[in-house]
Interface confidence: low
């Protein structure tokens, strides 16, 4: 597993990916399992109540490089990891929801620390 | 079910240490994104925030109150406290704790009167 | 620190009737990027914790009556109780959560005239 800004060695990618799908199933899955060209993702967001909710599932290869790579926005409490490196790799995957930070670190409107590993394998 | 219920010293003199206890069930504080406040309000007087404990630790104090304010957790036994050092007389008032930044779920308070 | 300003102080009504009261803020509270408001408003009943009424701005907590409704953007926010209940009197709070330190204003007090 790498930090965030350490590069990560190309590896070998399944044809198919196999991946643990929860909240985001497609109608096609079995046993919470969907398939993807591209990557397993787990990601952590507020809802409306302020609740946290996780969800994972299956990225294509489209995209999925921008959706996997987690910039940070103020005030969007979302945290997001991918991985690639074997079948359900995304069961291993605990991404944190940064909080909103003290004004005092921080130009601008807020207001998160990040302390979530991001957990990126091409 | 979420609930949250302070408790406190009741009376306590000037200059000494204020310890509150925030103890709450129906949610947890090892869940990612899961944090706690504490707000007090004077009698017949307003809110003010005071202080916030998140799940991985941060803290956030206010400003005006920084340098007397300690926040802390016991995530096991779902609780959080705070401590006010040095207290005066302006630090009467119920002490409540919350869940959240829009403060959802509210405790009952706590009085705590500051008197020589 | 941004400063939470309501008004008025205090509000006489009548039973039925419809009431405004207005939060004013030193700086916005809507976030671009979302286009959401990141305040709340509270209602507070003697001797009673504050309860949690709007957040988001204009968003009902679940379980608040529909004659309550919250609306505004940016700096300037509006608490509306359509048709005024007994029950209803109470003072309320707006509180921002755009930043820390988190700060409320000083409280609408809604009475019997």
């Known amino acids: 597993k790498k930090e965030d800004g350490e590069s990560t060695a190309p590896t070998a990618r399944p044809k198919v990916l196999r991946c643990k799908c929860h909240h985001h199933c497609p109608e096609d899955s079995v046993n919470n399992i969907c398939s993807t060209d591209g990557y397993c993702f787990t990601m952590i967001e507020e809802d409306d109540s302020g609740t946290p909710v996780v969800t994972s599932g299956c990225l294509g290869l489209e995209g999925s490089d921008f959706q996997c790579r987690d910039t940070p926005i103020p005030h969007q409490r979302r945290s997001i990891e991918c991985c690639t490196e074997r079948n359900e790799c995304n069961k291993d995957l605990h991404p944190t929801l940064p909080p909103l930070k003290d004004r005092d670190f921080v130009d601008g409107p807020i207001h998160h620390k990040h302390h979530h590993h991001h957990h990126h394998h091409h | 079910q979420v609930t949250l219920k302070e408790s406190g010293p009741g009376i306590l003199q000037p200059s000494q240490t204020l310890s509150l206890t925030c103890s709450f069930s129906?949610?947890?504080?090892?869940?990612?994104?899961?944090?706690v406040g504490w707000i007090r309000q004077p009698s017949g007087k307003g809110l003010e925030w005071l202080a916030h404990?998140?799940?991985?630790?941060?803290?956030s104090y206010n400003p005006a109150l920084k340098s007397r304010l300690t926040i802390s957790k016991d995530t096991s036994n779902n609780q959080v406290f705070l401590k006010i050092a040095s207290v005066v007389t302006a630090d009467t008032a119920t002490y409540y704790c919350a869940r959240g930044d829009r403060f959802a779920y509210w405790g009952q308070g706590t009085l705590v009167t500051v008197s020589a | 620190d941004i400063v939470m300003s309501q008004s008025p102080s205090s509000l006489a009504v009548s039973v039925g009737e419809k009431v405004t009261m207005s939060c004013k803020s030193s700086q916005s509270l809507l976030y671009s990027n979302n286009q959401k408001n990141y305040l709340a408003w509270y209602q507070q009943k003697p001797g009673q914790s504050p309860k949690l009424l709007i957040y988001w701005a204009s968003t009902r907590e679940s379980g608040v009556p529909d004659r309550f409704t919250g609306s505004g953007s940016g700096t300037d926010f509006t608490l509306t109780i359509s048709s005024v209940k007994a029950e209803d009197l109470a003072v309320y709070y707006c509180?921002?959560?755009?930043?820390?330190?988190?700060?409320f204003g000083a409280g609408t007090k809604l009475e019997l005239k």
């Open positions: 509180q921002q959560y755009y930043s820390f330190p988190l700060t």
């Open positions: 129906g949610l947890s504080l090892s869940t990612p994104g899961m944090s």
């Open positions: 404990i998140w799940w991985n630790d941060d803290k």
